[in-house]
């Protein structure tokens, strides 16, 4: 069921229901529970594209418009300092077999750039979103999703790949970021934390949400993911924050209720097709957008990130199920599978709505808003 929509001037306001978020193109590794320190990539330029390592009947466009509850930034918890134990390290790990690069996760050796040079690129993801500094771009139109309402049959593959839970999507799910910017959905995945520890990848003014869904898409200009890696706009990810609400989210429950079946790393099950768009916020018109990368090796750049302003509500029990059911490699719980936020290095985050106006708890002094660059290109 849908929850009311957020108010106009409240970035990242109240949640709608959304569907499950299986794994996305980044295969997310499991996270250690030990404290770790932020380790942003170096400032060196991204290797050339040739050096980048390796990561269909259209139903009507789903209208998105009911009123939603508001969550204002002043209600958010205080910012976590870099180096907070919740921040995973931008590193791969040495696996239990002693192999240097075969299995990686957040924290440990070797550093991700050794696994994939692109991880040291200048335009990496995730990032911290500061609505006050976002460039309002009226040319950013509401997203269009076509064919996302799947019938129960044929069933879809839901898999615990040791890094996340991934739902593989069939052909036919089309998404448009705007005219001529058309994509096909590939898969869904989730990032989460642990008990009492949030695990979203992106943050908002330093606030980390309980979890985050990524729906990964391939540009129609490319036939395969491998072709699109590192190419500007070759891949696009729709991201939404998941947070706690009073009611069970029926869309997500269709996936969460099956997690026990895939508790073991590498296990999979078949789930009935569902309305994938119900896993996302209902407001497709208000979002932040920037160019970044995959959030795990190969960390390929050129990925267009669209982060919904509206959040998705799950019950406390559902969030607990998400973070406390799956197991990763080496008999460790699959938890805290998120990468530390990366420096913008001059990138401008664009907003499809005037996010910087009357929306911040620090609006007392004038703020210089960025202007929209090349929106709609």
């Amino acid at each position: 069921q849908r929850l009311p929509r957020m108010q106009e001037d409240s970035p990242l306001g109240g949640g709608s229901s959304g569907e499950d978020d299986p794994l996305g193109e980044e295969d997310l590794p499991s996270e250690e529970d030990s404290p770790r320190e932020e380790d942003p990539p170096g400032e060196e330029d991204l290797p050339g594209e040739e050096d980048l390592p390796g990561e269909e009947d259209l139903p009507e466009v789903k209208p998105k418009s009911e009123e939603e509850g508001s969550l204002k930034l002043e209600d958010l918890p205080t910012v976590e300092a870099p180096g907070d134990p919740q921040e995973p390290q931008n590193n791969a790990h040495r696996d239990k077999e002693g192999d240097d690069q075969s299995h990686w996760r957040y924290g440990g050796d070797p550093p991700w750039p050794r696994v994939s040079p692109a991880c040291a690129g200048r335009f990496q993801s995730p990032v911290d979103i500061r609505p006050q500094l976002a460039a309002f771009c009226p040319a950013l139109r509401p997203l269009e999703l076509l064919g996302f309402q799947l019938p129960p049959l044929p069933e879809l593959r839901l898999r615990n790949n040791g890094h996340s839970v991934q739902l593989t999507l069939p052909p036919g799910l089309e998404m448009a970021l705007g005219p001529g910017r058309e994509y096909r959905a590939l898969q869904l995945h989730l990032h989460w934390g642990a008990a009492g520890r949030p695990g979203s990848e992106h943050t908002v003014e330093g606030h980390r949400f309980p979890a985050e869904i990524h729906v990964v898409h391939l540009s129609t200009a490319f036939a395969r993911v491998d072709e699109a890696l590192g190419r500007p706009g070759g891949l696009a990810v729709l991201a939404a924050f998941l947070e706690e609400g009073p009611e069970e989210n029926s869309a997500y429950e269709q996936l969460l209720s099956r997690l026990e079946e895939i508790a073991e790393e590498g296990s999979e099950t078949q789930v009935p097709g569902l309305d994938i768009s119900a896993l996302l916020p209902s407001d497709f018109s208000r979002y932040f957008q920037y160019e970044g990368s995959l959030t795990t090796p190969p960390c390929a750049q050129g990925v267009i990130w669209t982060v919904f302003n509206q959040t998705v509500m799950l019950s406390a029990k559902q969030l607990h199920t998400l973070s406390d059911t799956l197991w990763g490699p080496g008999d460790s719980r699959l938890q805290l599978n998120f990468r530390a936020t990366q420096p913008l290095n001059g990138r401008v985050i664009e907003a499809s709505f005037p996010a910087g106006v009357d929306s911040s708890p620090r609006a007392a002094e004038p703020v210089q808003l960025n202007s929209c660059l090349a929106a709609g290109d």
């Epitope: 295969d27 040739e50 050096d51 980048l52 390592p53 390796g54 990561e55 269909e56 075969s102 299995h103 990686w104 044929p154 593989t168 069939p170 052909p171 036919g172 096909r184 590939l186 391939l218 036939a223 395969r224 993911v225 491998d226 072709e227 890696l229 590192g230 190969p298 390929a300």
Partner: antibody, heavy 121, light 106 residues
Framework: EVKLEESGGGLVQPGRSMKLSCVAS????????MDWVRQSPEKGLEWVAE??????????HYAESVKGRFTISRDDSKSSVYLQMNNLRAEDTGIYYC????????????WGQGTTLTVSS | QIVLTQSPAVMSAFPGEKVTMTCSAS?????MHWYQQKAGSSPRLLIY???NLSSGVPARCSGSGSGTSYSLTISRMEAEDAATYYC?????????FGGGTKLEIK
């Protein structure tokens, strides 16, 4: 359980034609690209042809060595894929595998048991 | 087309021994995939997208690499691992395979 079963191989003279068939089961056939890959002692594993989905207008691609001679086709209602081979040459000899390629991903996740084609006079 | 060169062509290992084989591409590829083929059988997908294990593949197998250099490692050799292993790329058409590494058990 995913199954791919090839048929149609055998002994054929150079210059003649042969048609291979592959019947699939255990998955939604129309959701997957289908490919033929062959194997010979001389050339090892060699990709031959690919056919995509109805939504891709059943687009096809071929290896340079078979272009103009081989034609790949599919019948989603029968969960079958075919390889029509004309003007066969001795170098076409090998085991022909029917493979499934998940759309948009660059690998072959299931293979049939293979059918042997021998081109010899 | 992108040429994949596997080395060594043949190798042998004792049970429990660690085994590593490599695959070098003539130009950079985004992902490398690995297949196992036992005598008299068809190839089986072992690792996809460089490092992801296919369903049913034991955790002692792992893959890594980037750019033009990739490797497949078996942490502890077992008798059932005796087979020929092939790497494969599909960065561009045509998809190509390596010549294979035959792994024998001592």
């Amino acid at each position: 359980e995913v199954k791919l079963e090839e048929s149609g191989g055998g002994l054929v003279q150079p210059g003649r034609s042969m048609k291979l068939s592959c019947v699939a089961s255990g998955f939604t056939f129309s959701y997957y690209w289908m490919d033929w890959v062959r194997q010979s002692p001389e050339k090892g594993l060699e990709w031959v042809a690919e056919i995509r989905l109805k939504s891709d207008n059943y687009a096809t691609h071929y290896a340079e060595s078979v272009k103009g001679r081989f034609t790949i086709s599919r019948d989603d209602s029968k969960s079958s894929v075919y390889l029509q081979m004309n003007n066969l040459r001795a170098e076409d000899t090998g085991i022909y595998y029917c493979t499934r390629a998940p759309h948009y991903y660059g690998y072959f996740d299931y293979w049939g048991q293979g059918t042997t084609l021998t081109v010899s006079s | 087309q992108i040429v994949l060169t596997q080395s060594p062509a043949v190798m042998s290992a004792f049970p429990g021994e660690k085994v590593t084989m490599t695959c070098s591409a003539s130009s950079s590829v985004g992902y490398m995939h690995w297949y196992q083929q036992k005598a008299g059988s068809s190839p089986r997908l072992l690792i996809y997208d460089t490092s992801n294990l296919s369903s049913g593949v034991p955790a002692r197998c792992s893959g890594s690499g980037s750019g033009t250099s990739y490797s497949l490692t078996i942490s502890r050799m077992e008798a059932e691992d005796a087979a020929t292993y092939y790497c494969q790329q599909w960065r561009s058409y045509p998809p190509t395979f390596g010549g294979g590494t035959k792994l024998e058990i001592k």
